[in-house]
Each structure stands twice: as C-alpha cells, then as structure tokens.
C-alpha cells in the first residue's frame, strides 16, 4: 500500500470526509479525470487539481493533528507528479503564486501575452504551415 | 498574422504594458516556458498560465474598451490550448472555479484524494510493478 493512503484516511477523519453525504452532487475531480485519457490533457487537468490541494494544505499547515499527513502527501505528490524535480515544482509554485490583482503583474502578463499565445498549441514548434494543417485548414484572410 | 496579435497590442496600450520598465525583474511566464521542452511538462505550466489569463480577463470583462480584444484572445486560447473542445474547456473552468475555503468542497476534495493520487504519475495506469520500476526501485517496508 502506498504511504499516502494511510495519511489520506487520517485527513478523511479530520474533515469528516467519510460521511455518506460527501458523495452528494457528484465528484469534484474524479469524473473530470475519467474524461481525459491523453497524457497532455490529463496534465492540464491535474495541474489545476494539484494546485487546489496545495492551496488546501497551505490553509491547514499549522494544524498539528494533520501536519504529518499533509507533509507525507505533499512529498508523494512531488515524487509522482513532479518526478522529484524541484525545479519543476518551483516553477509551478511561482505560477500559482502570482497575484492577478497586482498591477505590475498584470502589465507583465499582458506584455508577455503574444509570446505565450504563440507557444500554446503543441504544433507551435513545428512552424506556421504545419500548425495551420493541425487546425484543419487556415484562417480565412482578414 | 494571427488575430490575437492585434488584440494583444491593444491590451498592451490599455495596460501601459509596452513601457520599458515592464521588463524589469525578469519575466512571469516566458523564462519558465523556456525551461520545459516535454509536452506534458509544458501542459502543467501552461495550465496555470491560461488560468491566470482567464482570471485576469474576468476582472476586466465589463470594460468596453478592451472587451473585443479579450473575447478574441479567449477564443484563440480555446482554439490553440483546448483544441476548440468545449468539454475540455468546461472541465478546466470547473476546476479553476472550486473554492478552497468552502467546507463542502474541502470534504469532497479530501474524500477523492486517494483516487486522485493513484492516477498522478503517468505509470499509474500500468500497475504497481511498472510504477516501482519508474521510481528505480520499490518502497522500503514501513
């Protein structure tokens, strides 16, 4: 049994998350994860899910009753999702910590938008002609 | 020229994001994107970047001066990042909209944690033995 299982069970007790009513109104994450089989699609969704859990754990980081459980689960996420790669984790953390209401951050984000957009589709790296084929045709001339 | 370019230039004017000082203290997103070549790693990072822009656009959705630009850019993100797949975009939006301070959401998230963790690593689908090889060994007995 993976180590996170015991610790997740401890969190369930702490949050009363084992009660039958928790399953009411569908799932948060599981149904969404079932929808996506492609690795890159899964990463798009899991990225949001992991950032949610990190925020949740941050809110409860000073609660001694669950500290060990939270630390074990975070370590496990770092091994499984970030491949124990601290640079990957650090870059991810930077992105999740930017404040969308900070005017300097807003200006930087808008300044970088064109370059970010240019890299958004997987085909961006293989040239304009190839990308246009991927979109099953080209844009009509403006 | 892709349609988002003109609209992003319009946003730059609106946010004074063309000023030289905007480049001070490094980039928000560009340096991070340069670090990651693997498609699945890029998706992890781009997922956070796209959710940042969506939040930013939401904050300015009622401003008539940039409404058209924002709509055009959002549409382009939907084409490029979500492959014009509305279900993918909807699932993504659901994940970004969960409130981490809502106790019902917290309970659901903790309830689903074990299953979410089980699927985090790419090798999760191919069983415990294969995954342990990916970690170059197995867990020591507790």
């Amino acid at each position: 049994q993976d180590p996170y299982v015991k610790e997740a069970e401890n969190l369930k007790k702490y949050f009363n998350a084992g009660d039958p009513d928790v399953a009411d109104n569908g799932t948060l994450f599981l149904d969404i994860l079932r929808n996506w089989k492609e690795e890159s699609d899964r990463k798009i969704m899991q990225s949001q899910i992991v950032s949610f859990y990190f925020k949740l754990f941050k809110n409860f980081k000073d609660d001694q009753r669950i500290q060990k459980s939270v630390e074990t689960i975070k370590e496990d996420i770092n091994v499984k999702f970030f491949n124990s790669n601290k640079k990957k984790r650090d870059d991810f953390e930077k992105l999740t910590n930017y404040s969308v209401t900070d005017s300097n951050v807003q200006r930087k984000a808008v300044h970088e938008l064109i370059q970010v957009m240019a890299e958004l589709s997987p085909a961006a790296k293989i040239g304009k002609r190839k990308r246009s084929q991927m979109f099953r045709g080209r844009r009509a001339s403006q | 020229q892709d349609p988002y370019v003109k609209e992003a230039e319009n946003l730059k004017k609106y946010f004074n994001a063309g000023d030289p000082d905007v480049a001070d203290n490094g980039t928000l997103f560009l340096d991070i994107l340069r670090n990651w070549k693997e498609e699945s790693d890029r998706k992890i990072m781009q997922s956070q970047i796209v959710s940042f822009y969506f939040k930013l656009f939401k904050n300015f959705k009622d401003d008539q001066r940039i409404q058209k630009s924002v709509e055009t850019i959002k549409e382009d993100i939907n084409v490029k990042f979500f492959n014009s797949n509305k279900k993918k975009r909807d699932d993504f939006e659901k994940l970004t909209n969960y409130s981490v301070t809502d106790s019902n959401v917290q309970r659901k998230a903790v309830h689903e944690l074990i299953q979410v963790m089980a699927e985090l690593s790419p090798a999760a689908k191919i069983g415990k033995r294969k995954r342990s090889q990916m970690f170059r060994g197995r867990r020591a007995s507790q």
Partner: antibody, heavy 124, light 112 residues
C-alpha cells in the same frame, strides 16, 4: 547543527554482502530525502541510491540496481545501504548526503550536507 | 545515456578569472537544477553553488554559477582566483525521477 555519520565499512571478499549505516542529527530527519554517493580511490563522485523521507520510495543507479538496497528507520534517524555480490569495483568511500525536504517548497539545498564517508574495500 | 561532461583540468593565475563548463549530453539543462561542489584532497565535497546560481552561506561572491540553454551547459565562474581555490570541482544535476548525475570532475590548478 546538521550531522551525518556513516559506519560499517571495512574489508570484505568479492561476492560477500555488507550493510553500511548512516545516523543523522540536527534536523527533522523524516522530512528529508537521503542519498548515498560513493567515490572510488582517485576517481570522481558516483551516485548510488536515494530514499525519500516519509514515503520511503527508493531510487537506484541503473548500474547498481538489483545488488544494492537502501532503507531507512525514521524513528532511529538512520539510513542503511545493503550491498550484496560485492565486486572489486565497489571499493570506494561511501558518503551519506542529505537531500531535499520535498514537503517544503522552501527546502534547503539538495546535497548540501555530507558525512565524512565510510570506506568499503572489496578484495580477496 | 545522460552525461555531464567537464574539462579534465583548468588553470589560472591568482587574481584572474576561470570558467569550468559542464555540458549535458541529452535532455535540457534548463529542466533540472545544477549544483557545483568543491573537493579538496582528503575532504568530503562541499557545495559552492546550488540551484543553478545560488551560493550557500559562507561561499564568497567570487563564485558564480549560470546555465546556458543554447549550449545545453552550465558554468562555474571563479573570479579573483586564490591559491585556496585549488581543488577538484564537480557539477551535478538529475535525470528521470530523482536520478542523480555527477560530472567527471575538473582539477583546478592555481599557477605561480
């Protein structure tokens, strides 16, 4: 003060087994990954194995997997490296090194703290 | 196979600047942190640079680290060379899941 102290080295014959130990102090031991790194006489550094903190996942060098086993006892602040089917080329100084605390995004640097090493000599 | 390649030896006069390179054979150097270690004879390695460009406390600012994605390499620069800098220097990075990789080492000789 962070300290890592290796022990258990010595002279063994080819084909024999040996377990070297590392006792740590000065930090919350269970939070940190621990690495074993070796250095043959007059040669460079070679990573051997790593064990994660609370989760106890084990990672091995491709060339050594199958012969070496890493384990830890968090209650005793100890890490062990069990080496079997030893060969002459395993002769080296074996260092115990503290890794990252992967539960903390502000963790101190990986491989910052090293022990003094324990010498393993494999010879007939 | 992943490799980190360093020059076997580098030398320089006191007060001068030397650069030790560390070239990654495959995979992107920018996708994993790079550390640098100094090892004097009879001592355990000591970190001089961590996470590409950061100095541990106690390491003078004569030591600096950088990463260049275009050449897929990392560099350790030592300025104002001193006789006590004479030692072996190793770069270190990662591949796969927590697989640790060391360069072959560079012997730094301070001339004069």
């Amino acid at each position: 003060e962070v300290q890592l102290v290796e022990s258990g080295g010595g002279l063994v014959k080819p084909g024999d087994s040996l377990t070297v130990s590392c006792v740590a102090s000065g930090f919350t031991f269970s939070n940190y990954f621990i690495h074993w790194v070796r250095q043959a006489p007059g040669k460079g550094l070679e990573w051997v194995a790593t064990i994660s903190g609370r989760t106890k996942y084990m990672f091995y060098s491709d060339s050594l997997r199958g012969r070496f086993t890493v384990s830890r006892d968090n209650a005793q602040n100890s890490v062990y490296l069990h080496m079997s089917s030893l060969r002459g080329e395993d002769t080296a100084l074996y260092y115990c090194v503290r890794g990252y605390d992967h539960s903390d995004s502000n963790s101190a640097a990986d491989l910052l703290h090293w022990g003094r090493g324990t010498l393993v000599t494999v010879s007939s | 196979n992943f490799m980190l390649t360093q020059p076997l030896s580098v030398s320089g006069y006191p007060g001068k600047t030397i650069v030790i390179s560390c070239v990654r054979s495959s995979g992107s150097v920018a996708s994993h942190y790079v550390q640098w270690f100094q090892q004097r004879p009879g001592s355990a390695p000591a970190m001089v640079i961590y996470e590409d460009s950061h100095r541990p406390s106690g390491i003078p600012d004569r030591f600096s680290g950088s990463v260049d994605a275009s050449s897929n390499s990392a560099s350790l620069t030592i300025s104002g060379l001193k006789t006590e800098d004479e030692a072996d220097y190793f770069c270190q990075s990662y591949y796969g899941n927590n697989q640790v990789l060391f360069g072959g080492g560079t012997k730094l000789t301070v001339l004069g």
